[in-house]
């Protein structure tokens, strides 16, 4: 039993990081391998996860960390029985793809303009809390060619747009994903989408 | 909110003992490493134990190395310093810390005075 | 005699910066994370800054801490009187596997 890709890990910088790593046969993970992780401290202790499959040869582990700052080092042995596979190093604050943010609405009762709000996946006392970025990507059910993405630079989990940009009269559904530019994460997944129907008073034409 | 609040101070001879409480809330006590750490009147910080979050390390002092016990009882979110053969020097205030690389929470600390 | 060299004592007017300092060796400072305490007067020590330079939160951001071989420094900019205190480093001593701290600072707010 061999690894044919070593593990790679990413940290949500809040209390996951997720490794993967692919076996060179079929394996199954879950009976067959362990995975140890511990932090680089005097006094911290050995944990242990249980890998699942994630495909014929592929394992993933969900490292269980009860915080993230950004000097920690975790040592990590992947083993088969008293086989040692593997010996690595993983620093979270290296390797961050930031949780998705969630509860994304739309609000079309504002006058022509359309307010969408999410919320910050992060308790306020985690470092990224006040370091994400966003990106708003909204489309239209009726015209793939109709799609569209929003860079949301700033703090606030909100974005305003004038719903005349959008046609009138159809479904749109929109998405959001964050990163953090100060660790150089990676994006996070999409949140869940939601749907509405855009409708919006045209304009009187003049002739 | 993370609360640490030790107990079982007081007044002890030389030669006698005593042992520290220090019960906690707000974080899962389990997963973290704890410590004891005191300050004589009028004096500096200076570390006592500190214990692993499994109990599986236990690193003391030289200065109370053969004397003094860190445990914890994971069950009943506490930790405990059994202090033996106590000095006159050993008289200080105890606090209890919740430990990372640094001490992140510390308790509000209990008066230990060893005296005749 | 501690194991961490702080200097016993130091002050500054509202407003002014003021630095600590705390030197050690390569078993301690050199290879490990340094860290901060404030004690104010009749209190707990509470955390102020940890792994060299980083801030918990609630900390203001005018306190900084840096590292440089086997020496640390903590900076108070715009000096209050509410920092009226005393100020500790710390850090793992690798010779002796203890936490080993600096003798302290006390500051003095004019």
């Known amino acids: 039993m061999k690894v044919l890709q070593e593990p790679t890990c990413v940290s949500d910088y809040m209390s996951i990081s997720t490794c993967e790593w692919k076996m060179n046969g079929p394996t199954n993970c879950s009976t067959e391998l362990r995975l140890l992780y511990q932090l680089v401290f005097l006094l911290s202790e050995a944990h242990t996860c249980i890998p699942e499959n994630n495909g014929g040869a592929g394992c993933v582990c969900h490292l269980l960390m009860d915080d993230v700052v950004s000097a920690d080092n975790y040592t990590l042995d992947l083993w088969a029985g008293q086989q040692l596979l593997w010996k690595g190093s993983f620093k979270p604050s290296e390797h961050v793809k930031p949780r998705a943010p969630g509860n994304l609405t739309v609000h079309t009762n504002v006058s022509d303009t359309l307010l969408l709000t999410w919320s910050n996946p992060y308790p306020p006392d985690n470092y990224l809390y006040n370091h994400l970025t966003y990106a708003v990507n909204i489309w239209s059910e009726n015209d793939p060619a109709d799609f569209r993405i929003y860079n949301v630079t700033y703090l606030e989990p909100s974005l305003r747009i004038a719903a005349s940009t959008l046609k009138s009269g159809i479904s749109y559904r929109a998405r959001v994903r964050a990163w953090a530019q100060c660790y150089n994460t990676t994006w996070s997944e999409w949140s869940p989408s939601t749907k509405w129907h855009n409708s919006y008073r045209e304009p009187f034409e003049q002739h | 909110e993370v609360q640490l609040l030790e107990s079982g101070g007081g007044l002890v001879q030389p030669g006698g003992s005593l042992r520290l409480s220090c019960a906690v809330s707000g974080f899962t006590f389990s997963n973290y490493a704890m410590s004891w750490v005191r300050q004589a009147p009028g004096k500096g910080l200076e570390w006592v134990s500190a214990i692993s979050s499994g109990g599986g390390n236990i690193y003391y002092a030289d200065s109370v190395k053969g004397r003094f016990t860190i445990s914890r009882d994971n069950s009943k979110n506490t930790l405990y310093l059994q202090m033996n053969s106590l000095r006159a020097e050993d008289t200080a205030v105890y606090y209890c810390a919740k430990l990372r690389r640094y001490f992140d929470y510390w308790g509000q600390g209990t008066l230990v005075t060893v005296s005749s | 005699q501690s194991v961490l060299t702080q200097p016993p004592s130091a002050s500054g007017t509202p407003g002014q910066r003021v630095t600590i300092s705390c030197s050690g060796s390569?078993?301690?400072?050199?290879?490990?994370?340094v860290n901060w305490y404030q004690q104010l007067p009749g209190t707990a020590p509470k955390l102020l800054i940890y792994d060299n330079s980083h801030r918990p939160s609630g900390v203001p951001d005018r306190f900084s801490g840096s590292k440089s071989g086997t020496s640390a420094s903590l900076a108070i900019s715009g000096l209050r009187s509410e920092d009226e205190a005393d100020y500790y480093c710390?850090?793992?001593?690798?010779?002796?596997?203890?936490?080993?701290f600096g003798g302290g600072t006390k500051l003095t707010v004019l």
């Open positions: 710390g850090t793992w001593d690798a010779s002796l596997s203890a936490y080993v």
């Open positions: 390569s078993s301690n400072i050199g290879n490990n994370y």
